[in-house]
Amino acid sequence: IVGGQEAPRSKWPWQVSLRVHGPYWMHFCGGSLIHPQWVLTAAHCVGPDVKDLAALRVQLREQHLYYQDQLLPVSRIIVHPQFYTAQIGADIALLELEEPVNVSSHVHTVTLPPASETFPPGMPCWVTGWGDVDNDERLPPPFPLKQVKVPIMENHICDAKYHLGAYTGDDVRIVRDDMLCAGNTRRDSCQGDSGGPLVCKVNGTWLQAGVVSWGEGCAQPNRPGIYTRVTYYLDWIHHYVPKKP
């Protein structure tokens, strides 16, 4: 997370850390708890060549990475069938946990938005994660969860910005309908935040607007962060994840 600050312990109870096996269980992406047994993340975190179940664990909300790990095994990894690369879209995936999480005030699910929600500019939105704090600058120990408030940008404006200095023709969309833009040169998500949630407060409820997906660098001029637009994939999500009763 570029800019922002350490998150208060009481906030973002749906944030999870995805871990890959190595010399230690290393954080490599974020995710969000959308159901006691389901995590939403980015497809590019776990695909297109899907990792072994044995190579992956989920760590629920913790203030500092690695300090109180209780790693959870995953029983299923579901990558959106249309995913190939983040830039093309469909950068969304689901992880089913072997056992449902015991929800509490400290760890619970985030609400998915209604399909009609557009998340217009001006809405109070935040992105969270344990990713880099600047381009090629890692989050330093003790690896606190960070948060930053990011401004939403309309897709057509974001697309125009991404065309500046790019070889892509103006008639070719870079920012697609299944994407959402947020951030500026002082506030952005970065490498290691991928898969984590962009949430916005709507009528007093935190709704997950986006999944950290891609961008050209972090907090670069005319290059806002690009997120998978959750509303675009609600039907796909609910094909697997039970709706709340």
Partner: antibody, heavy 119, light 106 residues
Amino acid sequence: EVQLVESGGGLVQPGGSLRLSCAASGFTFSDYGMVWVRQAPGKGLEWVAFISSGSSTVYYADTMKGRFTISRDNSKNTLYLQMNSLRAEDTAVYYCTRRNYDDLYFDVWGQGTLVTVSS
Amino acid sequence: DIQMTQSPSSLSASVGDRVTITCSASSSVTYMYWYQQKPGKSPKPWIYRTSDLASGVPSRFSGSGSGTDFTLTISSLQPEDFATYYCQHYHSYPLTFGQGTKVEIK
């Protein structure tokens, strides 16, 4: 001593049912995913079914789906395999195994129980 | 479903020989697991996560590979190594084993 002891095997007619049990001791049973593996006479190992520590997740080999049911009773430290609509090709030694907590390999095996399906 | 194919199905070797068993997965996996079984006995865990030796396994055993092709190697075959070896993946369900490789005395 960490131990798994299977029981319940025997001779059953085609179409019949059998319930295998596996008694676990020497470890905290409720912390571990458990697996049944079988081996037909003179043949190789075949994965049968998996159950997670709290029973929320179960998976079966395709040929056993709909006929076999894996379950567990953590209060009794016991794993079960209910086998229905048995066929001759289900004849095998059935092993109960513990899945290693960290690395997911099958680190503890029972001695096996022989199931014979024959008329 | 991922299919596992071991080769050879059986081999004859002498004490002191270097022996290599291969396991091929029908699609890419991250890790391979190996088990040893002797006649009339339950299988034992032998190698996990491709190259880590299970407790009590002698250092003459090694595992390697990535993607779809994995190997178990015995650098110098000993009498107690004559057994059948099985590979297994833990990529996704259903889990599958290879058909086994029987290592016999020449």
